[in-house]
Interface confidence: low
């Protein structure tokens, strides 16, 4: 059940986000989340994950990229990119060449 907290061993992760109480946190896995809100520059947050492991398997989009790893401080030097904005879909009636 992805909603239940992990029962596995904990790892120490780099913590860099508004929620951090210090430079590291402890969790079931480490995370890096790159988020771009409308009209703003992308923000990268580093921290720990305990719930919703399924987010780790999500594909990057133009708005969010969610990275997870499972070893000590493994999120420290990770840099993420967002997917490039998709080009407008071709208009009906064109042959795409």
């Amino acid at each position: 059940d992805p909603v239940k907290p992990s029962r596995g061993p904990l790892v120490t992760c780099t913590c860099e986000s508004p929620h951090c109480k210090g430079p590291t946190c402890r969790g079931a896995w480490c995370t890096v989340v790159l988020v771009r809100e409308e009209g703003r520059h992308p923000q990268e947050h580093r921290g720990c994950g305990n719930l919703h492991r399924e987010l780790c398997r999500g594909r990057p989009t133009e708005f969010v990229n969610h990275y997870c790893c499972d070893s000590h401080l493994c999120n420290h030097n990770v840099s993420l990119v967002l997917e490039a904005t998709q080009p407008p879909s071709e208009q009906p009636g064109t042959d795409g060449q």
Epitope: R7, C25, N50
Partner: nanobody, 121 residues
Framework: QVQLVESGGGLVQSGGSLRLSCAAS????????MGWYRQAPGKQRELVAA???????NYADSVKGRFTISRDNAKNTVYLQMDSLKPEDTADYYC???????????????WGQGTLVTVSS
């Protein structure tokens, strides 16, 4: 937000037994690791025994075969059965829990106030 209440410490003769217990309360979603640490006068705090939510235990070499850690997940309680106590076991014993609070983003460390165990020769 979280309270760890320890009990069971006291004075005991060498070779005797004590049972420590520690109950965690508060806005807790889940506790992962629970354990006991001890600190003798003039020494650093050291791990005595710890146990995961799944029941996997590990012990300091100095207490293996004498101490047994167990826990009740439903009650967020951890126990330390201490047998064949020695004078060198004399210390303040601290309960530790690593858990996730409601509204929390990751696990946090919580500590009890400590309970004194004195083993006389």
């Amino acid at each position: 937000q979280v309270q760890l209440v320890e009990s069971g410490g006291g004075l005991v003769q060498s070779g005797g037994s004590l049972r420590l217990s520690c109950a965690a309360s508060g806005s807790i979603i889940s506790i992962n690791d629970m354990g006991w640490y001890r600190q003798a006068p003039g020494k650093q705090r050291e791990l005595v025994a710890a146990i995961t939510r799944g029941g996997t235990a590990n012990y300091a070499d100095s207490v293996k075969g004498r101490f047994t850690i167990s826990r009740d997940n439903a009650k967020n309680t951890v126990y330390l059965q201490m047998d064949s106590l020695k004078p060198e076991d004399t210390a303040d014993y601290y309960c530790n829990a690593v858990g996730l609070l409601r509204g929390g983003y990751w696990y946090e460390d919580w500590w009890g106030q400590g309970t004194l165990v004195t083993v006389s020769s």
